[in-house]
């Protein structure tokens, strides 16, 4: 069945049941996600605007899918398996009486079950499993996933230590001078350099030692966290930001309307689901898109891919690859490639690495 092909997943609570305080709803949903993040490499982040991977909805009767709710009792909730659009979304029947305790229907316990579906789990035949199809109240203070639940979710995503580069469980700001720090995306924006990581970005103003950390949502509330690639076309005052199979256009530091759009509008084949890194070279007026161990070259004037691509990164960028995390263009002759906690200054005229640095070397660490 389907799974999320990433470990950083956003959710949004679309609306709130009047049965509970908003804070109690937020807490129940957060704790329910935490149940699954505790046993997997997955990390969940709540967003308040924009498109989340998982939308949490309280609704009654017919509510915008093929599966109308049935009034009090019976079907309590349903959730869609991972995917775009409605994929991953969890719907709770507003005709139930949602509670924080054993009376009515416990929101936390129901949400744990539904989020299991949102992550790709089916029902379990083990009556002790939270993924067993029928609702049964258990003490939420001592609640634990069954061995069957853990086996199921870890068969899809692995165990928690399988991805050390994920954001901190509490989503706190990563330590800037951590020698293992890596970045999701890096780009110039005028005379500044933006370094993206999880839901944060650092701003480095050229030649100044001081850097500042910011939430992506504080600058661009409609953008998601976990930006995966970015590039700038300075002459047009444009910045392109990528996440999964979508991209956003920022003009003069303002998000353009009618975005996100599909990365496939650039001409990528269907199998490309995300961009690892991107960089625009104003000398050639070409953008290089890095995907796994390959790269594409896009003609920004003709708005189409150059023929003969993709090519292997290792074949054409000596010493770089096979995969990269981020890249940006600087000083009219260098690409700065980021791979994990390492960074390579690459002279594209000489076509070789001229310096090896730590990824956070820009911050005076």
């Amino acid at each position: 069945g389907p799974v999320w092909r990433k470990h950083y997943i956003t959710y949004r609570i679309n609306n709130y049941t009047p049965d509970m305080n908003r804070e109690d709803v937020d807490y129940a949903i957060r704790k329910a996600f935490q149940v699954w993040s505790n046993v997997t490499p997955l990390k969940f982040s709540k967003i308040n605007t924009g498109m989340a991977d998982i939308l949490v909805v309280f609704a009654r009767g017919a509510h915008g899918d093929f599966h109308a709710f049935d009034g009090k009792g019976g079907i309590l909730a349903h959730a869609f398996g991972p995917g775009s659009g409605i994929g991953g979304d969890a719907h709770f029947d507003e005709d139930e009486f949602w509670t924080t305790h054993s009376g009515g229907t416990n929101l936390f316990l129901t949400a744990v079950h539904e989020i299991g579906h949102s992550l790709g789990l089916g029902h379990s035949s083990d009556p002790k499993a939270v993924m067993f199809p029928t609702y049964k109240y258990v003490d939420i203070n001592t609640f634990r996933l069954s061995a069957d639940d853990i086996r199921g979710i870890q068969s899809l995503y692995g165990d928690p230590k399988e991805n050390q580069r994920l954001p901190n469980p509490d989503n706190s700001e990563p330590a800037l001078c951590d020698p293992n720090l890596s970045f999701d995306a890096v780009t110039t924006v005028g005379n500044k350099i933006f370094f993206f990581k999880d839901r944060f970005f650092w701003l480095k103003v050229s030649e100044r030692p001081k850097t500042s950390v910011n939430l992506i949502s504080s600058l661009w509330p409609t953008l998601p966290s976990g930006i995966e690639a970015a590039y700038e076309i300075e002459a047009r005052n444009q910045v392109f930001l990528f996440k999964d199979d979508k991209y956003w256009l920022i003009s003069n530091l303002r998000p353009e309307p009618n975005y996100p759009k599909s990365i496939h509008s650039f001409g990528f084949p269907n199998f490309v689901k995300k961009i690892d890194a991107a960089v625009f070279n104003p000398r050639f007026y070409r953008t290089y898109f890095f995907v796994d161990n390959q790269y594409w070259r896009y003609d920004e004037r003709r708005q189409m891919m150059d023929p003969g691509y993709p090519k292997l990164i290792t074949k054409n960028f000596q010493g770089i690859g096979p995969k990269i995390d981020a890249v940006f263009y600087s000083k009219n002759k260098y690409y700065y490639f980021f791979q994990g906690s390492n960074q390579f200054e690459y002279d594209f005229l000489l076509q070789r690495i001229t310096k090896t640095l730590k990824s956070n070397s820009w911050f005076g660490c």
């Epitope: 069945g1 389907p2 915008g64 093929f66 398996g81 995917g83 659009g85 994929g87 089916g122 996100p260």
Partner: antibody, heavy 122, light 103 residues
Amino acid sequence: EVQLLESGGGLVQPGGSLRLSCAASGFTFSWYWMHWVRQAPGKGLEWVSGIVSSGGTTIYADSVKGRFTISRDNSKNTLYLQMNSLRAEDTAVYYCAKDIRGPYSSGLFDYWGRGTLVTVSS
Amino acid sequence: DIQMTQSPSSLSASVGDRVTITCRANQSIYTYLNWYQQKPGKAPELLIYAASSLQSGVPSRFSGSGSGTDFTLTISSLQPEDFATYYCQQAGIFGQGTKLEIK
């Protein structure tokens, strides 16, 4: 490449029966919800019926409930629509359409067949 | 029951024009709205899903927006091949269609 090919359409008298088939290829048929959507001549699109990947859950538009039966044979990669007690207003091109996989239908039809024409007339 | 109202039912425009088609639901459908294009004698093709996501292979001149009850499909610069009928859809309910014709 995903392909859906409908067959079984034709001319039938009111009250008669017809069975439509949709042969699927280019994807793992047994993972996906499948649907029938119809279009009367010169009119808009009307959803008819859907079936879960396993075949265990079926859903119908009110206009066909009790008369039409959707089914599938995953071993043959084929979707069916058994149409009984046909009426003149059932005259339409019938399309089969692919949905996403999962226990619930997304209502997102990403691939469609070319359609087969059913004419109900005396 | 949920109903979808699409407008206009027909529209005349010229190549290069910017065109907007709207779809309204009688209750919130969140972002669960899709747009399809259908050319005469052909099957419908998915253009936009989840209100604003462009289906793979669809040109970027097509865009969708909206959430809740009000949705729009925009074609930023009409091309000759865009003259067709457009449908909004949410689960088992389709809008009545908008026929886009050459002026």
